[in-house]
Interface confidence: medium
């Protein structure tokens, strides 16, 4: 038997992926475990093999279909179970009634690019990936810029309270290397959380013209 406290957390990417993390204090390291998804109103079910991500936590992705297919709706409830093999049997270790649109975490924004750069400002655009059409414009973004000599954690957060897939960064220093990241969150869902940060976009401001004030 497996003792200890268990935590089972899953998020839906709004299209065709449910990502789950199961942590269990005192779990057996050599036990084979999986997540089983049983939707209450769909004629399919899905499993994924839990793989270790740390000493006491495992993760897996339930791939429900093609990346941009709308596999679940706001009314779906998916029974998610962690099943671990005990001899010839599977034992239910954790269970939750998962409401996909209450537990959203979108994919990180993609295709970041510099639209226009000057000495003191830079206009950057991006795209959202695999986001449901249900959201329409009900999304918000956070962005951060990494300045020389600082860490990402020190970077101030810029909040965009609407679906705006671009930003104009102001008051930058000329001829300086920066990095930029953005993340997205739907306004819907009691347990919805921010997407992962995008891959950083590196850019350099233009040098100031000689003889001009900076």
């Amino acid at each position: 038997a497996v003792n200890g406290t268990s935590q089972f957390t899953c998020f839906y990417n709004s299209r065709a992926n449910i990502s789950c993390v199961w942590s269990q204090d005192g779990a057996l390291q050599d036990t084979s475990c999986q997540v089983h998804a049983w939707p209450d109103r769909r004629r399919w079910n899905q499993t994924c093999e839990l793989l270790p991500v740390s000493q006491a936590s495992w993760a897996c992705n339930l791939i429900l279909g093609a990346p941009d297919s709308q596999k679940l709706t706001t009314v779906d409830i998916v029974t998610l179970r962690v099943l671990c093999r005990e001899g010839v049997r599977w034992r239910v270790m954790a269970i939750q009634d998962f409401k996909p649109f209450e537990n959203l975490r979108l994919m990180a924004p993609i295709s970041l690019q510099v639209v226009h750069v000057e000495t003191h400002r830079c206009n950057i655009s991006w795209e959202i990936s695999q986001a449901s059409h249900y959201f329409e414009r009900h999304l918000e973004f956070e962005a951060r810029t990494l300045s020389p000599g600082h860490t990402w954690e020190e970077a101030p957060l810029l909040t965009l309270k609407q679906k705006q897939e671009w930003i104009c960064l102001e008051t930058l220093t000329p001829d300086t290397q920066y990095e930029f990241q953005v993340r997205v969150k739907p306004l819907q869902g009691e347990f919805t959380t921010w997407s992962p940060w995008s891959q950083p976009l590196a850019f350099r401001t233009k040098p100031a013209a000689l003889g001009k004030d900076t």
Epitope: W38, D40, R41, R43, L80, I95, D97
Partner: antibody, heavy 119, light 106 residues
């Protein structure tokens, strides 16, 4: 064979409480969601709420806070606890289960139990 | 909440007649069901997911529609079809039913 059997109905005074039971057989309540639906005399059907296979509940806002759905897995039985009852809660109360998927609609119904709220 | 409006609220037809009931939703729904309720009995599922016949249901019953407009048809009314018929949506919570259509024999 899937069967649902409600009990616990009767006459209750306004402001009183009542607990209805729904005994399930032919399936496990930990594998299917079960719903409560009522029908006032001569009126239509009103969905009250559900308890899902994992044990979480969902309610119609019209009764949320007054009605509570629970279950006893060992008895394979569902409950509807009704508090602060009003005359307009007078109805036949049904428990119902969908087919293998909710996609299939309410394929299984109990026979209903009558609740009368009157002084 | 999604309002489901059935019409007519009652109808009287002869044995063998074709009977049609409509159900209008206040917004688009994607999962629609039809139930039959005989006097003093629990409802019985007839049609699931708009047009699929539930197990054991005679083929004279059928359903169609999409979006906000749905239709239920009895191709040849039989004496045992005397009942009230309800539509129900399962596209959003709370689940809602139509107010019912009472079918009688002339």
């Amino acid at each position: 064979e899937v069967q649902l059997l409600e009990s616990g109905g009767g006459l209750v005074q306004p402001g009183g409480s009542l607990r209805l039971s729904c005994a399930a057989s032919g399936f496990s309540v930990t594998s299917y969601g079960v719903h409560w639906i009522r029908q006032a005399p001569g009126k239509g059907l009103e969905w009250l709420g559900a308890i899902w296979s994992g044990g979480s509940t969902q309610y119609n806002a019209a009764v949320k806070g007054r009605f509570t759905i629970s279950r006893d897995n060992s008895k394979n039985t569902l409950y509807l606890q009704m508090n602060s009852l009003r005359a307009e809660d007078t109805a036949v109360y049904y428990c119902a289960r969908a087919g293998d998927y909710n996609y299939d609609g309410f394929a299984y119904w109990g026979q209903g139990t009558l609740v009368t709220v009157s002084s | 909440d999604i309002q489901m409006t059935q019409s007519p609220s009652s109808l009287s037809a002869s044995v063998g007649d074709r009977v049609t009931i409509t159900c209008q939703a206040s917004q688009s729904v994607s999962f629609l069901y039809w139930y039959q309720q005989r006097p003093g009995k629990a409802p019985r599922l007839l049609i699931y997911d708009t047009s699929n016949l539930a197990s054991g249901v005679p083929s004279r019953f059928s359903g169609s529609g999409s979006g906000t407009s749905y239709t239920f048809t009895i191709s040849s009314l039989q004496p045992e079809d005397i009942a009230t018929y309800y539509c129900q949506q399962w596209s959003t919570y709370p689940l809602t039913f139509g107010q019912g259509t009472k079918v009688e024999i002339k």
